[in-house]
Amino acid sequence: ATKLTEEKYELKEGQTLDVKCDYTLEKFASSQKAWQIIRDGEMPKTLACTERPSKNSHPVQVGRIILEDYHDHGLLRVRMVNLQVEDSGLYQCVIYQPPKEPHMLFDRIRLVVTKGFSGTPGSNENSTQNVYKIPPTTTKALCPLYTSPRTVTQAPPKSTADVSTPDSEINLTNVTDIIRVPVFN
């Protein structure tokens, strides 16, 4: 198995992590996709997932996590808004393809969130916390948990990540179709 690689992103509290995970267009377009945190000992845990089948350009918000699957571009966009120091950890995008193992989209994201300096745009928590006030619903999780080791047989597409401050974020207050999709770091 190929060694798992990771990209490190250092952000300030209040900023937004914006990750684009590329995938093969036709093959995985409607497959359910998920954002996971990696616990100690290679134990991924799902934090949020798209619907099943995954809808095109349809935002799914789970707390401060927003997933958007762009079928036409073959990418899953993951945003974690209003970042907190406790969000620091190792994350990955995966595509569910039961009964087979989930397909992991490289690279893993090593997120390091530090305290912002007062007065800097990235440290203004209030600029995002009211925009993303959609609580999770309480229906049973739709995301299955796959626990097999993440092995890779070929070099998968690379994921890319951008960062932005709260001021550049899109207001998602009218996102109503929220999928409730659990977590260790």
């Epitope: 934090l47 789970v62 049973k140 626990t147 999709v181 659990p182 977590v183 260790f184």
Partner: antibody, heavy 120, light 112 residues
Framework: QVQLVQSGAEVKKPGASVKVSCKAS????????MHWVRQAPGQGLEWMGV????????SYAQKFQGRVTMTRDTSTSTVYMELSSLRSEDTAVYYC?????????????WGQGTLVTVSS | DIVMTQSPLSLPVTPGEPASISCRSS???????????LDWYLQKPGQSPQLLIY???NRASGVPDRFSGSGSGTDFTLKISRVEAEDVGVYYC?????????FGGGTKVEIK
């Protein structure tokens, strides 16, 4: 239905090792993480670690690092917890507990417990 | 490690009366997905623990509706609206926000 059946009580001498088993049935064994939690007599619950039954990877509490080994046998749907260099403070009931799937990180099924007594 | 502090240590109750147990964590248990990773278990005498509440406020399947969980971040409460004799045992909160998982010290509920 889901069942976790643990091995019987053990009496060990200080310095020895003990290996407790937990046989799972009623679900897909490799699809759920399995944790080990112990409880000393009259005391509270203490998390020891977790094993991924599919890949066999593990994560242990710092306190038990170097003394505990968690393994699994997928052919028999059994997980094992071995604790070495036993001391009297290790006298406890040891539980295996299955972690729920999806987002909900709770223990939905527990074994009946295995009493391990460490005494000279 | 996250430290979980439960109170009271012991709670003598009268059947039919309400009861409340508090649990505090040294760090926030609220994850980025909006869920509080705090669960409540009841361990009846001579039995394995059983799940009551998960993710802070969700009642587990088969748990009577007299049990409710509330709170967010670092402060959580388990409430029993009307205690029944079968509710005696030790109640534990546990955080599943990060490894190592850590349990509260337990609250022993007994009938007066």
């Amino acid at each position: 239905q889901v069942q976790l059946v643990q091995s019987g009580a053990e009496v060990k001498k200080p310095g020895a090792s003990v290996k407790v088993s937990c046989k799972a049935s009623g679900y897909t064994f490799t699809s759920y993480y399995m944790h080990w939690v112990r409880q000393a007599p009259g005391q509270g619950l203490e998390w020891m670690g977790v094993i991924n039954p599919s890949g066999g990877s593990t994560s242990y509490a710092q306190k038990f690092q170097g003394r505990v080994t968690m393994t699994r046998d997928t052919s028999t749907s059994t997980v094992y917890m071995e604790l070495s260099s036993l001391r009297s403070e290790d006298t406890a009931v040891y539980y295996c507990a299955r972690e729920s799937d999806g987002i909900d990180s709770y223990f939905d099924y527990w074994g009946q417990g295995t009493l391990v007594t460490v005494s000279s | 490690d996250i430290v979980m502090t439960q109170s009271p240590l012991s709670l003598p109750v009268t059947p039919g009366e309400p009861a409340s147990i508090s649990c505090r964590s040294s760090q926030s248990l609220l994850h980025s997905n909006g869920y509080n990773y705090l669960d409540w278990y009841l361990q009846k005498p001579g039995q394995s623990p059983q799940l009551l509440i998960y993710l802070g406020s969700n009642r587990a399947s088969g748990v009577p509706d007299r049990f409710s969980g509330s709170g967010s971040g670092t402060d959580f409460t388990l409430k029993i609206s009307r205690v029944e004799a079968e509710d005696v045992g030790v109640y534990y909160c546990v955080q599943a926000r990060q490894t190592p998982l850590t349990f509260g010290g337990g609250t022993k509920v007994e009938i007066k």
